[in-house]
């Protein structure tokens, strides 16, 4: 089982849409795949895929999940808020027929505030 996640870095404006993609590949067929998205280490959702369908369509606040055969799991955040900024990781595990798991690399999401003055204040608050 292998998981490739993208993009590595995503910068979007508050109120717009962010799309995170996870490609899950397995050399042999699987009956049930457990998937998980985390943000800053906290679980956003942990549905499974069987018979070509996701058991859950929502994933965290304003998050929509979709599965596109053969291998693409997409997390769409819409509308994006400042709270969505963080480090996202996609994880997958084949539960049937045999347990095998893998996770992607981090996608770092940066959300720019709609108000440019907020943006200036935020940049000014960085140390150094």
């Amino acid at each position: 089982l292998s998981v490739q996640q993208g993009p590595n870095l995503l910068q979007v404006r508050q109120g717009s849409q962010a799309t995170l993609v996870c490609q899950v590949d397995q050399a042999t067929a699987w009956e049930r795949l457990r998937v998980k998205w985390t943000k800053d280490g906290a679980i956003l959702c942990q549905p499974y895929i069987t018979n070509g369908s996701l058991s859950l369509g929502v994933c965290g606040p304003q998050g929509r999940l979709s599965w596109q055969a053969p291998s693409h799991l997409t997390l769409q955040l819409d509308p994006v808020s400042l709270n969505h900024s963080g480090a996202y990781v996609c994880w997958a595990a084949v539960e049937i027929p045999e347990l095998e798991e893998a996770e992607g690399n981090i996608t770092r999401l940066f959300v720019d505030p709609d108000d440019p003055t907020q943006n200036r204040n935020r940049i000014a608050s960085f140390p150094g």
């Epitope: 089982l1 292998s2 050399a27 042999t28 067929a29 699987w30 095998e100």
Partner: antibody, heavy 120, light 113 residues
């Protein structure tokens, strides 16, 4: 460019252990998503998958070989090996190593194969 | 184990004519999760290792001539060579990767008539 090369004795006595090594060049056997297999072809041309070791060191074997088979690896030498115990004349075959990936699940690179005869 | 049954065992076709090789699996190789058939076709010429032609039942590997095509789904699959060339003389094998153990068909020997 990935290349695989089998090595080992061409003659093994019945009841002994057949040991072969596959040396991989141009690619790391620890690369995520890749599987390293042993396949044999009998004199009558029939192909049999014996088992694989994956990028994390996990293994899967053909149940028909009844625990006679072990596949291991040496990442420092970028090699993986086959051991087949209690051989008989029926194990006489050409032994090939091959690789496949999760994303494209086919044997895309094969070694040239090495003929092993089991005979006293 | 999934049993792969190939037919015919051998086939003689005139140059320029169509060659058809069949492969039947003892259980379905189609997954609704991935919308894929877990079946590959290989060509093996004398003294060489097998070479992949077709994967996922119908996807031709880059560099393989377009006279080779794969079709079928579930349990019944076909490899077709639309216009046989002299260099196509070889043994052809189907192989599933639906589950372990991975198994091969017994092969079809293709010759020129």
């Amino acid at each position: 460019q990935v290349q695989l090369q089998e090595s080992g004795p061409g003659l093994v006595k019945p009841a002994q252990t057949l040991s072969l090594t596959c040396t991989v060049s141009g690619f790391s056997i620890s690369t995520s998503g890749y599987y390293w297999s042993w396949i044999r072809q009998f004199p009558g041309k029939r192909l049999e998958w014996m088992g694989y070791i994956n990028y994390g060191g996990g293994t899967s074997y053909n149940p028909s070989l009844k625990s006679r088979v072990t596949i291991s690896r040496d990442t420092s030498k970028n090699q993986f090996s086959l051991k087949l115990t209690s051989v008989t004349a029926a194990d006489t075959a050409t032994y090939c190593c091959a690789t496949m990936a999760d994303r494209f699940a086919f044997f895309d690179v094969w070694g040239q194969g090495t003929m092993v005869t089991v005979s006293s | 184990d999934i049993v792969m049954t190939q037919s015919p065992d051998s086939l003689a076709v005139s140059l320029g004519e169509r060659a058809t090789i069949n492969c039947k699996s003892s259980q379905s190789l189609f997954s609704s999760n991935t919308n894929r058939n877990y079946l590959n076709w290989y060509q093996q010429k004398p003294g060489q290792s097998p070479k992949l032609l077709i994967y996922h039942a119908s996807t031709r590997l880059s560099g393989v001539p377009d006279r080779f095509s794969g079709s079928g789904s579930g349990t019944d699959f076909t490899l077709t060579i639309s216009s046989l060339q002299a260099e196509d003389v070889a043994d052809y094998y189907c192989q599933h990767h639906y589950e372990t153990p991975l198994t091969f068909g017994d092969g079809t020997k293709l010759e020129i008539k």
